[in-house]
Interface confidence: medium
């Protein structure tokens, strides 16, 4: 839109654009006269002065009460109220490189950076965070303890969407064939607990065995799954008759 302060447009008096051009493309200044570089996020926009141009596509000019701290506004003695370009879409988006960007504008910036290095452009695959298969953040640890003790295994997993966590007991018959038993089954000395967190898209699960019996010895598997895949980690519970039977160093992570 034209401003009262604009006056007649004299293209010959327009300042030259940088020789290499503008990463976000060209637009016209606030008077609609001179070509200027399109403004990016956090850059000044609007106003009648020549050179105070319009925002790049996907951005809008918004009045800000703050000065541009440490940026050009404050340095140039700009006004207390400043209009800056902000991204219209302020929600996360998933890039074709599998990285989640806080906004479409940041994805576009990353894409232009990649292209400038001779790499492939990054495109938006979907709105929202990128989906990813589960991975085990903290696997369960092997446990050695005596009959009658109270023991627990814990497992922390992450994935997008948030994974579903289950526990299996791994059994091997005499011929070595492996099969799994979904826990807790009908065991009354065994409890399963799951909670969300501690971080976003994480789940933590526990198996509590109390009292511990010889039949509880074996391999326990924490299994996480979502629409993107699955992951699992296992730990052994070894049951002994007396504490002195527990080796002092039974591999890293072995605990009572």
């Amino acid at each position: 839109s034209s401003s009262d302060a604009c006056g007649p447009c004299v293209p010959a008096s327009c300042p030259a654009l940088p020789r290499l051009g503008c990463p976000l493309g060209e637009t016209r200044d606030a008077c609609g006269c001179c070509p200027v570089c399109a403004r990016g996020e956090g850059e000044p926009c609007g106003g009648g002065a020549a050179g105070r141009g319009h925002c790049a596509p996907g951005m809008e000019c918004v009045k800000s009460r703050k000065r541009r701290k440490g940026k050009a506004g404050a340095a140039a003695g700009g006004p207390a109220t400043l209009a800056v370009c902000v991204c219209k879409s302020r929600y996360p988006v998933c890039g074709s490189n599998g990285i989640t960007y806080p906004s479409g504008c940041q994805l576009r910036a990353a894409s232009l950076r990649a292209e400038s290095r001779g790499e492939k452009a990054i495109t938006q695959v979907s709105k929202g965070t990128c989906e990813q298969g589960p991975s085990i953040v903290t696997p369960p640890k092997d446990i050695w303890n005596v009959t009658g003790a109270k023991v627990f295994l814990s497992c922390e997993v992450i994935g997008i969407p948030t994974p579903v966590l289950i526990w299996n007991k791994v059994k091997r018959d005499h011929s070595g064939v492996q099969r799994t038993e979904l826990l807790p089954g009908d065991r009354e000395n065994l409890a399963i607990q799951t909670r969300g967190g501690p971080e976003k898209h994480e789940v933590t699960g526990w198996v509590l065995v109390s009292p511990l019996s010889k039949e509880d010895a074996g391999e326990y598997e924490c299994h996480a799954s979502n629409s993107q895949g699955q992951a699992s980690a296992a730990a052994k519970i070894t049951v002994v008759d007396a504490l002195h039977e527990i080796p002092l160093k039974k591999g890293e992570g072995a605990q009572l």
């Epitope: 940088p18 020789r19 290499l20 570089c37 990016g40 940026k71 050009a72 506004g73 140039a76 232009l112």
Partner: nanobody, 128 residues
Framework: SVQLQESGGGLVQTGGSLRLSCAAS??????????MGWFRHAPGKEREFLTA????????YYTDSVKGRSTISRDNAKNTVYLQLNNLKPEDTAVYYC???????????????????WGQGTQVTVSS
């Protein structure tokens, strides 16, 4: 006044790497208000523009002579711009200069006359 000080140059073998730094200082100099560029000057040749980065660090530009084997970056908190040079060749031997241009907007500057402040340069020698 504004000072730009390059460092990180030296003697390197063909195929080697170097990371050049350019530290900016000066009273009332707001580093994050400046677009930065790297140039080089080889004996008997004109000063050659290599790469540029916008004030925010969001956008970068590389000429064909260094594209794919160099990375420009900046740390506005440290008032420093960097140039990582990989797979160096004997023809990369030159004095490397950084330069600063006041710019409130995302724009690239490539000509010597567009830049306001220059460093003293750091020598890079690539031996075969």
């Amino acid at each position: 006044s504004v000072q730009l000080q390059e460092s990180g140059g030296g003697l390197v073998q063909t195929g080697g790497s170097l990371r050049l730094s350019c530290a900016a200082s000066g009273r009332s100099f707001t580093f994050s208000s400046y677009a930065m560029g790297w140039f080089r000057h080889a004996p008997g040749k004109e000063r050659e523009f290599l790469t540029a980065i916008t004030w925010s660090g969001d956008y970068t530009y590389y000429t064909d002579s260094v594209k794919g084997r160099s990375t420009i970056s900046r740390d506005n908190a440290k008032n420093t711009v960097y140039l990582q040079l990989n797979n160096l060749k004997p023809e990369d031997t030159a004095v490397y200069y950084c330069a600063a241009k006041f710019s409130q907007v995302s724009a690239f500057f490539a000509t010597v006359s567009e830049y306001e402040y220059w460093g003293q340069g750091t020598q890079v020698t690539v031996s075969s």
